[in-house]
């Protein structure tokens, strides 16, 4: 488990970290995961990578941002507002909500405390 | 029934101390965050500190950090504020809350509140 | 000066509806869960809703709670004279690391 290097992390400069950061194979390594491998994916080519290599991509993505609650908390937001329209009914958002909160945990990061997903204005 | 109940409440001259206990009962006092909110005279609230569980992480406001301490007692399920170098803008009634905050994807709320405690800080 | 800002006083008649906003930035209302409180007169408050929507067992379907960006918003509908009191929002502040309470609004029954 990573440590944390700081309490919070300013929240422009997550910002700027989050917008920098290629935030693509977390969003397409949780529709795999969601959609299953062997369904396709419209909005990408996922059948050439696997679910496993799109984790790895994604979890030194989320590396290059500093560790902290709030900056992951940030990326997750933004991964959750990036694939909301994407999402087809209640029970998909759901899923994808379940499998983004798990992406810490699977790249070895503290979950974000407090952090709301439901950040896309009812939208999602 | 949840109960908190306050005490330890009293007139405090400025740059003295005071301890306030909160007894809980009525619910698993060592699987909760605690927090101590206060409410300056006709005033609004105002967040003072939170505890999580098992006490290994607290929260403090700026204006009271290094001045206060708070610390549970999961064995008693007693809730402490230990109050330092208090001074008139620490006036108020001090309330102990049951934090319903979870450890990730979940907020501060209070759903439980005692009947709170007067601390006057005056010469 | 609260940095989470509330009318400081609204009122109406009973038995109509009102909505008592609750504005924040990116930091706090942003990116972190809202709940709302009750203070009645010489009481301590009560939690009326949290995480943004959600009401304890015990509170009427009357009072509802939404969040739009760095906004929030408490609704009451069928405003009955025992409503009349303080009503307060709260969230978490991760620049701060602290919990913020709006400055309440003073809810008066006519």
């Known amino acids: 488990m990573r440590r944390e290097r700081g309490r919070q992390g300013d929240s422009s400069s997550c910002e700027r970290q989050v917008d920098r950061v290629n935030l693509k194979p977390c969003e397409q390594h949780i529709m795999q995961r969601i959609m299953g491998e062997q369904e396709q994916y419209d909005s990408y080519d996922i059948r050439s990578t696997r679910s496993s290599d799109q984790q790895q991509r994604c979890c030194d993505e989320l590396n290059e941002m500093e560790n902290t609650q709030r900056c992951m908390c940030e990326a997750l937001q933004q991964i959750m507002e990036n694939q909301c329209d994407r999402l087809q009914d209640r029970q998909m958002v759901q899923q994808f909500k379940r499998e983004l909160m798990n992406l810490p945990q699977q790249c070895n990061f503290r979950a974000p405390q407090r952090c709301d997903l439901d950040v896309s204005g009812g939208r999602c | 029934e949840v109960q908190l109940v306050e005490s330890g409440g009293a007139l405090v001259q400025p740059g003295g101390s005071l301890r306030l206990s909160c007894a809980a009962s009525g619910f698993k006092f060592s699987t909760f965050y605690m927090t101590w909110i206060r409410q300056a005279p006709g005033k609004g609230l105002e967040w003072v500190a939170n505890?999580?569980?098992?006490?290994?992480?607290?929260d403090y406001l700026d204006s009271v950090r290094g001045r206060f301490n708070i610390s549970r007692d999961n064995a008693k399920s007693v809730l402490y504020l230990q109050m330092n170098t208090l001074s008139a803008d620490d006036t108020g009634v001090y309330y102990c809350t049951r934090n319903g905050l979870q450890d990730s994807y979940s907020g501060d709320f209070f759903d439980h509140w005692g009947q709170g405690i007067l601390v006057t800080v005056s010469s | 000066q609260s940095v989470l800002t509330q009318p400081p006083s609204i009122s109406a008649a009973p038995g109509q509806k009102v909505t008592i906003s609750c504005s924040g930035t990116?930091?706090?209302?942003?990116?972190?869960?809202v709940s709302w409180y009750q203070q009645l007169p010489r009481t301590a408050p009560r939690l009326l809703i949290f995480?943004?929507?959600k009401r304890p067992s015990g509170i009427p379907d009357r009072f509802s709670g939404s969040k739009s960006g760095s906004s929030a918003t408490l609704g009451i509908t069928g405003l009955q004279t025992g409503d009349e009191a303080h009503y307060f929002c709260a969230t978490w502040d991760a620049d701060l690391s602290a919990v913020l309470f709006g400055g309440g609004t003073k809810l008066t029954v006519l």
């Open positions: 990116g930091s706090n209302i942003g990116h972190n869960y």
């Open positions: 995480d943004n929507t």
């Open positions: 505890i999580k569980q098992d006490g290994s992480e607290k």
